[in-house]
Amino acid sequence: DLKVEMMAGGTQITPLNDNVTIFCNIFYSQPLNITSMGITWFWKSLTFDKEVKVFEFFGDHQEAFRPGAIVSPWRLKSGDASLRLPGIQLEEAGEYRCEVVVTPLKAQGTVQLEVVASPASRLLLDQVGMKENEDKYMCESSGFYPEAINITWEKQTQKFPHPIEISEDVITGPTIKNMDGTFNVTSCLKLNSSQEDPGTVYQCVVRHASLHTPLRSNFTLTAARHSLSETEKTDNFS
């Protein structure tokens, strides 16, 4: 009996430019003889419904149709037919199929590969054209993929134990697509510093599929009109 097992859940998520290993494990009732077996990896893009051969291994012959694609012969001996793709790109997302032949048996498995890019975030203070005691803080998130992103603003006053989400005076612009396929977006917070308590911490919170925990950039309102510093951008609430 010949069986192939892919990533549990049927989906693998990998960061852009990463050296990704797409898992494929072979289960066979006898020890594997790699000289008399074949492995073929196929890829089907998200945009075209056409399957393309990525890598092929047959006995003493192996060929990478995608530059750098490799299946380790040493790992194959122990049933690991995982495909390694260096420097994965956004357009390489899609369905990958691992086909194993141990004559006369054949088994296959598929997995969806999602390529994500994590946003970089920075805070900017824009005082151009603003009234007295009025500041506009801009939170720029750039280089992320996929397009779906959630940007919120929070404040934490001195007195209360938890942060408060700010919904008023927040404008988040449209996402802009970059040449490399990633996206940028800017969210703005308008603050009247004269109405806020000194010591209040404000932060821009970015949530995205590529992030395990939200990305935060913050600043503390001082008695004087505020200017951002690098330390404040990375400081915790503490």
């Epitope: 001195q158 007195k159 209360f160 134990p161």
Partner: antibody
Framework: QVQLVQSGAEVKKPGASVKVSCKAS????????MNWMRQAPGQGLEWMGG????????DYNEKFKGRVTMTVDTSTSTVYMELSSLRSEDTAVYYC??????????WGQGTLVTVSS | DIQMTQSPSSLSASVGDRVTITCKAS??????VAWYQQKPGKAPKSLIY???NRYDGVPSRFSGSGSGTDFTLTISSLQPEDFTTYYC?????????FGAGTKLEIK
């Protein structure tokens, strides 16, 4: 990292007073507001009051006004909560707490105060 | 003072179950609600703030929802370490007030 270390357990007689301390470390002490909570055995949580650590502002729960006093010693980064005219229903674990960071608010380990004749 | 009415006061469930705890505020508190977990003999640990935002490090099986007066804490798939007591708290105004707690027990 932020740490709030409270004084040890106390046993008091009804009518007496108790003073619980909370020593803070790991952050700029005076920039914060410290709350005090209590929890009677097997019961819920109750806010008693708070103090701004620069020492210029307090806010007490009406229920405890006249019996509770919160003070600060900035030289030792310590906050004190004194409760007077103790009665048996004041038997509880007393906690100092401070506003948090991304992982939540900070709490001391708690101080058990037992009021018994 | 704002009253926070939490229900149920106790709840029996099994590992893997989905459970929901509710909290009702006596007046509109917006989204200014936090949820705590407290293990015996320990200080409470905050899980959720602003009604639905998880603190970093809190497992994704914990989620909060609601605004105004009605709030819920949901644990999507109970783990052995989740069987303990949970409290809601309003922080829109002083005095800060808590729900009476929900004790989650193994069935």
């Amino acid at each position: 990292q932020v740490q709030l270390v409270q004084s040890g357990a106390e046993v008091k007689k009804p009518g007496a007073s108790v003073k619980v301390s909370c020593k803070a470390s790991g952050y700029t002490f005076t920039n914060y507001w410290m709350n005090w909570m209590r929890q009677a055995p097997g019961q819920g949580l109750e806010w008693m009051g708070g103090i701004y650590l620069s020492g210029d502002s307090t806010d007490y729960n009406e229920k405890f006004k006249g019996r509770v006093t919160m003070t600060v010693d900035t030289s030792t980064s310590t906050v004190y909560m004194e409760l007077s005219s103790l009665r048996s229903e004041d038997t509880a674990v007393y906690y100092c707490t401070r506003r948090g960071d991304y992982f939540g608010d900070f709490w001391g380990q708690g101080t058990l105060v037992t009021v018994s004749s | 003072d704002i009253q926070m009415t939490q229900s149920p006061s106790s709840l029996s469930a099994s590992v893997g179950d989905r459970v929901t705890i509710t909290c009702k505020a006596s007046q509109n508190v917006g989204k200014y609600v936090a949820w705590y977990q407290q293990k015996p003999g320990k200080a409470p640990k905050s899980l959720i703030y602003s009604a639905s935002n998880r603190y970093d490090g809190v497992p994704s099986r914990f989620s909060g929802s609601g605004s105004g007066t009605d709030f819920t804490l949901t644990i999507s798939s109970l783990q052995p370490e989740d069987f303990t007591t949970y409290y809601c708290q309003q922080y829109i105004s002083y005095p800060l007030t808590f729900g009476a707690g929900t004790k989650l027990e193994i069935k």
